[in-house]
């Protein structure tokens, strides 16, 4: 598989790695989201590990207000992070795509 | 970096790998998009390599109708593919996240 295809596969599998732990196996509850962010996106969270910070992230992602994050909401979130990364990328004129 | 962070990095770097080839270096024109899809997402395109198919994809992605695909439109597109992959994933009850 090409790197971009693998990237999409990682996005899907990471969601299900955590969504299946409690309750609705196709949605992330707050505990599952917290674990996903802490383990899989530590650079996004940084030092914001207090409860209120997680509640805010959860609230911002939960567009249908059901106290859970479904796959579509998760994709919107990752798109936002990618767009933030892209803004940084575009701000560095000579930046080459990072080699793996 | 964690796999999900690397996945986001691949999404950004893949876009710029092609967007910088012609014209606006922060947008994909039709030629660049065609090359990106053919080389980086062959499983998405499958056998649909005719001109009309590309025009259709381009039209669907180009939400602001400027005949180019910016990073946000590209993210929406990838989210749609991820959601299609996820529907397949959810349709297979015993499917484990694919190991890399």
């Amino acid at each position: 598989a090409r790197p971009l295809e693998e990237a999409l596969d990682v996005i899907v599998s990471t969601f299900h790695k955590y969504s299946g732990k409690e309750g609705d196996k196709f949605k992330l509850n707050k505990t599952e989201l917290k674990e996903l962010l802490t383990r899989e996106l530590p650079s996004f969270l940084g030092k914001r590990t207090d409860e209120a910070a997680f509640q805010k992230v959860m609230s911002n992602l939960d567009s249908n207000r059901d106290n859970e994050v479904d796959f579509q909401e998760y994709c919107v979130f990752l798109s936002c992070i990618a767009m933030m990364c892209n803004e940084f990328f575009e701000g560095c004129p000579d930046k080459e795509p990072r080699k793996k | 970096a964690r796999p999900l962070e690397e996945a986001l990095d691949v999404i950004v770097s893949t876009f710029h790998k092609y967007s910088g080839k012609e014209g606006d270096k922060f947008k994909l024109n039709k030629t660049e998009l065609k090359e990106l899809l053919t080389r980086e997402l062959p499983s998405f395109l499958g056998k649909r390599t005719d001109e009309a198919a590309f025009q259709k994809v381009m039209s669907n992605l180009d939400s602001n109708r400027d005949n180019e695909v910016d990073f946000q439109e590209y993210c929406v597109f990838l989210s749609c593919i991820a959601m299609m992959c996820n529907e397949f994933f959810e349709g297979c009850p015993d499917k484990e996240p694919r190991k890399k």
Epitope: G23, K30, Q55, S59, N60, S63, R65, D66, N67 | -
Partner: antibody, heavy 120, light 107 residues
Framework: QVQLQESGPGLVKPSQTLSLTCTVS?????????WNWIRQFPGKGLEWIGH???????NYNPSLKNRLSMSRDTSKNQFSLKLSSVTAADTAVYYC?????????????WGQGTLVTVSS | DIQMTQSPSSLSASVGDRVTITCRAS??????LNWYQQKPGKALKLLLY???RLHSGVPSRFSGSGSGTDYTLTISSLQPEDFATYYC?????????FGGGTKVEIK
């Protein structure tokens, strides 16, 4: 201390559009909260109307969706409600509220309410 | 929509009494249940959220319990300022819905 203040006409004619604005003070009108409209009928029953929040995301009560429009103006710390084709059944006290980001998204701050009467 | 049914619709009690109000949801609301107090001519005030968590500034005589579809608000020792109407509200899904209210009056 967060304060919410509703404003708008107290009397609206049947078939016209009810327009209300809520001004938020004492707190920045941030993305961390959803901003709601709730109404209380003369019989004291409460009905959630809808809200606007993160990224301009809007959710409406399906029972009112066809007549409802909500918007916000972050520069003025305001959000507003428009309810079209009103009838006497829309007579109520209208409250604007802030929806907290805590579990269950409770309404932690309320305006004092404004009575809207629909009558010719 | 999730229907919320409160009981009783009114009750009479004396200062110092223990008062219990119940709220039943038409389906499991996973503890996403909030309680409010309203005094005549005033807006509602949040008391408890997520079944049992006390909102800031609310006296500890107010407590909540329950799970699934059945929830309870308890006032351990009724005070003069507690005579009011109490509403439950589900925060589980949209549209948000409220109970019909319980009016607590002086006996």
């Amino acid at each position: 201390q967060v304060q919410l203040q509703e404003s708008g006409p107290g009397l609206v004619k049947p078939s016209q559009t009810l327009s209300l604005t809520c001004t938020v003070s004492g707190d920045s009108f941030t993305n961390d909260y959803y901003w709601n409209w709730i109404r209380q009928f003369p019989g004291k029953g409460l009905e959630w109307i809808g809200h606007i929040g993160y990224g301009g995301n809007i959710n409406y009560n399906p029972s009112l969706k066809n007549r409802l429009s909500m918007s916000r103006d972050t520069s003025k710390n305001q959000f507003s409600l428009k309810l079209s084709s009103v009838t006497a059944a829309d007579t109520a006290v209208y409250y604007c509220t802030r929806e907290s980001f805590y579990d269950g998204y409770p309404f932690d701050y309320w305006g004092q309410g404004t009575l809207v009467t629909v009558s010719s | 929509d999730i229907q919320m049914t409160q009981s009783p619709s009114s009750l009479s009690a004396s200062v110092g009494d223990r008062v219990t109000i119940t709220c039943r949801a038409s389906q499991d609301i996973r503890n996403y249940l909030n309680w409010y107090q309203q005094k005549p001519g005033k807006a509602l005030k949040l008391l408890l959220y997520y079944t049992s968590r006390l909102h800031s500034g609310v006296p500890s005589r107010f407590s909540g319990s329950g799970s699934g579809t059945d929830y309870t608000l308890t006032i351990s020792s009724l005070q003069p300022e507690d005579f009011a109407t109490y509403y439950c509200q589900q925060g589980n899904s949209l549209p948000r819905t409220f109970g019909g209210g319980t009016k607590v009056e002086i006996k």
